[in-house]
Interface confidence: low
Amino acid sequence: KGMHVAQPAVVLASSRGVASFVCEYGSSGNAAEVRVTVLRQAGSQMTEVCAATYTVEDELAFLDDSTCTGTSSGNKVNLTIQGLRAMDTGLYICKVELMYPPPYYVGMGNGTQIYVIDPEPCPDSD
């Protein structure tokens, strides 16, 4: 059966361009190896924002140069996307894959609409 993935419908990024949300997946049994991918959907195009594989023993680890950070706890993954600007406003989809042990399962959330508002420039002080 397709794995259910839940994520919030809407998140507002902070003034510093940071957005956090929880991605929760439902599965029977504990996967030893899980891969989480954040995809951004713009129209019919889907692009990968970041991805990380984690195991029961190891913490969720994105690449050093990734725009994402995260922590995992059971079937929940706390994702944080950094460096967002107004132009990055869009639908961010959480894809979860249970890689090991078999069987392979994959699920995609309905997406989190992240709104990013560029901060107003500070007025010059005389």
């Epitope: 059966k1 397709g2 042990p101 069987p103 392979y104």
Partner: antibody, heavy 120, light 106 residues
Framework: EVQLVQSGAEVKKPGASVKVSCKAS????????MDWVRQAPGASLDWIGN????????SYNQKFKGKATLTVDKSTSTAYMELSSLRAGDIAVYYC?????????????WGQGTLVTVSS | QIVLTQTPLSLSVSPGEPASISCSAS?????MHWFQQKPGQSPKSWIY???ILASGVPDRFSGSGSGTDFTLKISRVEADDAGVYYC?????????FGTGTKLELK
């Protein structure tokens, strides 16, 4: 280019064992599970099981437990399937197969097949 | 285990005509994968993840479906399409293949 090259056809006597090899090249052997599939003459495909070459952990179709044993030799990037207590019902072509992508599971690459015949 | 039943068992189609093969699963699956096999050859990945054509597969082919009912369609059959087509599920172990559908040309 990903290649899976299997050992040649075998003719065995009933009760004997046979070990079929599948040599992998063109990718990092330990990155992908190796699955094995059976096709009896004129029949559909039957999944036997798979092995994770990295951890050497296996998953078997209950139907083939005790019949097939899957192993790997990481040093030569070769997967093996041993069939024991052979009988006429084991006559088939046996394939090794590998997923097409680390994160999307489907059998994209197949060996050429090894015909195992059991005859007294 | 999930049983995959293909219909029809065989079909004979004239070149240029459409063709359709169904695969019914005994319980819901996430994706369906399809393979083509010609006599004396290994199976070839044909359509994966329900609707994605494998490399080199002509766009006359398409895959669709969800839950328990999946379909492989050919818009205009050509001589090279002859062979046996198998569906396969990987949602639960043991992995299972369909009964196969033999496509012949008239």
């Amino acid at each position: 280019e990903v290649q899976l090259v299997q050992s040649g056809a075998e003719v065995k006597k009933p009760g004997a064992s046979v070990k079929v090899s599948c040599k992998a090249s063109g990718y990092t052997f330990t990155d992908y599970n190796m699955d094995w599939v059976r096709q009896a003459p004129g029949a559909s495909l039957d999944w036997i099981g798979n092995i994770n070459p990295n951890s050497e952990s296996t998953s078997y179709n209950q139907k083939f437990k005790g019949k097939a044993t899957l192993t790997v030799d990481k040093s030569t990037s070769t997967a093996y399937m041993e069939l024991s207590s052979l009988r006429a019902g084991d006559i088939a072509v046996y394939y090794c197969t590998r997923d097409g992508n680390r994160y999307d599971a489907w059998f994209a690459y197949w060996g050429q097949g090894t015909l195992v015949t059991v005859s007294s | 285990q999930i049983v995959l039943t293909q219909t029809p068992l065989s079909l004979s189609v004239s070149p240029g005509e459409p063709a359709s093969i169904s695969c019914s699963a005994s319980s819901s699956v996430t994706y369906m994968h399809w393979f083509q096999q010609k006599p004396g050859q290994s199976p070839k990945s044909w359509i994966y993840s329900t609707s994605i054509l494998a490399s080199g597969v002509p766009d006359r082919f398409s895959g669709s479906g969800s839950g328990t009912d999946f379909t492989l369609k050919i818009s205009r059959v050509e001589a090279d399409d002859a062979g046996v087509y198998y569906c396969q599920q990987r949602t639960s172990y043991p992995l299972t293949f369909g009964t196969g559908t033999k496509l012949e040309l008239k």
